[in-house]
């Protein structure tokens, strides 16, 4: 068993069970759940004499941890005296110590109810310059209470002289006020009113509420990205739980496989959102082969605030497959932005919708943050399409004027990737690439070519690819500008872009 520090509990009798003429009385201290031996128990008896006896440690059956009791017998004016039991456990650390201070006996008492009330917002729903918190400690048997205010668990320096106590019948109530600046209140800190009474602690906490009521908790389970699956060959799936109210209860996420086979070790991350809610993500590495062969993975979510467990399942998408078509083009120079250009990539007619898009320059993959790619949208047919946008600088294109848009998709053959290159200055004859305004929509074509063939290869228009007037009879998608290049000795190919 690993090292475990003890839990310490005072042992006292009920005051009504101690005869009023008793000249001596015994109290005790229990140290339990520690490992290994030993613990050292000492007593502070104040001005009184006392004899102590520490019983041999016993082993707790289930855990193998130890428990021991130390007894203190005192005589004299014990009724008004407080006693401290000091437990040290050097195996935990050389300075590990727990002190418990208590009286000889415990009276029957009604514990207090602790409630924090806060001052209202103004009529417009805004916070005033100062916020008052009122701690109501009510309904307890009269006796000494200590009130402490905490800010994010740290004791605050507060003037407690304002605390007032009233008695109603046999029970007492006390209230303490804390004034905070608006800045402190809006800083999202937690304020706690902590009450110590009869050796017990009672508390209530409050903080600025979230700006909006969180919706019900939602859970989502992602499929692995094609890039992770086919290129990196280390696919992961992520279970995402959003809109949790922060609380003492933790979110429990359990992974399983429909086949019953064991799952890998998952990693977990918790993030507090600006609206006060909590987002929890758990990422599970999955086997490439397991995924491709159709294994179903399940994420089960439980939490005290969830009425019922939530289950999310994910597996490889079924249905027809179609490889993506990739078209890359550069926007023309725009007034006032000579040192920057936007490259665009249209990827379309792929199925299923899972796709990864990357941009490369100088054979190096650019960071994902450099480009912006839309979510897959359905085409009018049965496939999907995405657009990806990349901003490039003059320094980059002057270093090497070739940028590659690459799509990773399971239906692309032979290696699950399709890519097209695009240049900022493709050197088109006709010169409209350098135009100072957005060009009219045109079709680019070679003089000799009569039909529009399917794209067979290549990436950017060749200098022999001429810009011509748009032709309504030209086949192909009407919303795109298409360039046909006559390749020597090969099938012609298309380039889609702006001339």
């Amino acid at each position: 068993a690993s090292t475990q520090s003890p839990s310490v509990f005072p042992l006292t009798r009920c005051c009504k069970n101690i005869p009023s003429n008793a000249t001596s009385v015994t109290l005790g201290c229990l140290a339990t759940g520690y490992f290994p031996e030993p613990v050292m128990v000492t007593w502070d008896t104040g001005s009184l004499n006392g004899t102590t006896m520490t019983l041999p440690a016993t082993t707790l059956t289930l855990s193998g941890h130890y428990a021991t009791i130390s007894l203190l017998t005192v005589s004299g004016a014990w009724a008004k005296q407080m006693f401290t039991c000091r437990v040290a456990h050097t195996p935990s650390s050389t300075d590990w110590v727990d002190n418990k201070t208590f009286s000889v006996c415990s009276r029957d008492f009604t514990p207090p109810t602790v409630k924090i009330l806060q001052s209202s917002c103004d009529g417009g729903g805004h916070f005033p310059p100062t916020i008052q918190l009122l701690c109501l400690v009510s309904g307890y048997t009269p006796g000494t209470i200590n009130i402490t205010w905490l800010e994010d668990g740290q004791v605050m320096d507060v003037d407690l002289s304002t605390a007032s106590t009233t008695q109603e019948g046999e029970l007492a109530s006390t209230q303490s006020e804390l004034t905070l600046s608006q800045k402190h209140w809006l800083s999202d800190r937690t304020y706690t009113c902590q009450v110590t009474y009869q050796g017990h602690t009672f508390e209530d906490s409050t903080k600025k509420c979230a700006d909006s009521n969180p919706r019900g908790v939602s859970a989502y389970l992602s499929r692995p990205s094609p890039f992770d699956l086919f290129i990196r060959k280390s696919p992961t799936i992520t279970c995402l739980v959003v809109d949790l109210a922060p609380s003492k209860g933790t979110v429990n996420l359990t992974w399983s496989r429909a086949s019953g086979k064991p799952v890998n070790h998952s990693t977990r991350k918790e993030e507090k959102q600006r609206n006060g809610t909590l987002t929890v993500t758990s990422t599970l590495p999955v086997g490439t082969r397991d995924w491709i062969e159709g294994e179903t993975y399940q994420c089960r979510v439980t939490h005290p605030h969830l009425p019922r467990a939530l289950m999310r399942s994910t597996t490889k998408t079924s249905g027809p497959r179609a490889a993506p078509e990739v078209y890359a083009f550069a926007t023309p120079e725009w007034p006032g932005s000579r040192d920057k250009r936007t490259l665009a990539c249209l990827i379309q007619n792929f199925m299923p919708e899972d796709i990864s898009v990357q941009w490369l320059h100088n054979e190096v993959q650019l960071p994902d943050a450099r480009h912006s790619t839309t979510q897959p949208r359905k085409t009018k047919g049965s496939g999907f399409f995405v657009f990806s946008r990349l901003e490039v600088t003059r320094a980059e294109w002057e270093q090497k004027d070739e940028f590659i848009c690459r799509a990773v998709h399971e239906a692309a053959s032979p290696s699950q990737t399709v890519q097209r290159a695009v240049s900022v200055n493709p050197g088109l004859a006709g010169g409209s690439a350098q135009s100072q305004r957005a060009p009219d929509r045109v079709l680019c074509h070679s003089g000799q070519q009569q039909g529009l063939p399917r794209a067979a290869g290549g990436s950017v228009p060749h200098p022999r690819c001429h810009c011509g007037a748009g032709r309504a009879d030209w086949p192909g998608p009407p919303e795109l500008d298409v360039c046909v290049e006559e390749a020597e000795g090969e099938a012609p190919w298309t380039w889609t872009g702006l001339c």
């Epitope: 019900g216 908790v217 399983s256 439980t302 005290p304 009425p307 019922r308 467990a309 999310r312």
Partner: antibody, heavy 119, light 110 residues
Framework: QVQLVESGGGLVQPGGSLRLSCAAS????????MTWVRQAPGKGLEYVSI???????WYANWASGRFTISRDNSKNTVYLQIDSLRAEDTATYYC?????????????WGRGTLVTVSS | DIQMTQSPSSVSASVGDRVTITCQAS??????LAWYQQKPGQPPKLLIY???TLASGVPSRFSGSGSGTEYALTISSLQPEDFATYYC????????????FGGGTKVEIK
């Protein structure tokens, strides 16, 4: 096998109270969220309340205040306390077990106990 | 709260017929639509969960489909024992929800 047996129903006067019990056997009660569903004679199913594995509970809007769900895992029993009974509470009350893996509905139902509210 | 609207409220059909019952949710359901069958004097029985997964022991003539807000239960070839009332349930509420059951569809003999 999994069994849920409801008891505690019967004829009660308006304004009275009842405590329905659901004895569970054949599975580990503490692993399952538990639900009470009721069905008025000739009508559809109506969700009343759910208690999760942590012992926290939720109620349908109309049930809040008069209905109290609780569970005692050591006794393998789930309870539904109904106060201030009204004629419209007349129904068969079903105790039901939510699937363990979650968000997949109710996989086992008791046979129900009939509550009749009438003067 | 998500409301579940089931239609039709009743349907008359013959043995061997294909019967489809629909259930519309007032908001999208991410996961967890269930279908139940109930016969007179009996508790409901789980048929389908997670939109389309057949519960244990349920004949393959029952199938569930749909996503978002539109769901359907289809009985491909109605059998004598299938004459009953069917309920859909939004089984995925992660917060307080009022009635999570549809109003029910009674499948009667024509």
């Amino acid at each position: 096998q999994v069994q849920l047996v409801e008891s505690g129903g019967g004829l009660v006067q308006p304004g009275g109270s009842l405590r329905l019990s659901c004895a569970a056997s054949g599975f580990t009660l503490s692993n399952h969220d538990m639900t009470w569903v009721r069905q008025a004679p000739g009508k559809g199913l109506e969700y009343v309340s759910i208690i999760n594995t942590y012992g926290n509970h939720w109620y349908a809007n109309w049930a809040s205040g008069r209905f109290t769900i609780s569970r005692d895992n050591s006794k393998n029993t789930v309870y539904l306390q109904i106060d201030s009974l009204r004629a419209e509470d007349t129904a068969t009350y079903y105790c039901a077990r939510e699937t363990h893996h979650g968000s997949s509905g109710i996989d086992h139902w008791g046979r129900g106990t009939l509550v009749t509210v009438s003067s | 709260d998500i409301q579940m609207t089931q239609s039709p409220s009743s349907v008359s059909a013959s043995v061997g017929d294909r019967v489809t019952i629909t259930c519309q949710a007032s908001e999208s359901i991410y996961s967890g639509l269930a279908w139940y069958q109930q016969k007179p004097g009996q508790p409901p029985k789980l048929l389908i969960y997670d939109h389309s997964t057949l519960a244990s022991g349920v004949p393959s003539r029952f199938s569930g489909s749909g996503s978002g807000t539109e769901y359907a239960l289809t009985i491909s070839s109605l059998q004598p024992e299938d004459f009953a009332t069917y309920y859909c349930q939004h089984a995925d509420y992660a917060h307080h929800s009022d009635n999570v059951f549809g109003g029910g569809t009674k499948v009667e003999i024509k």
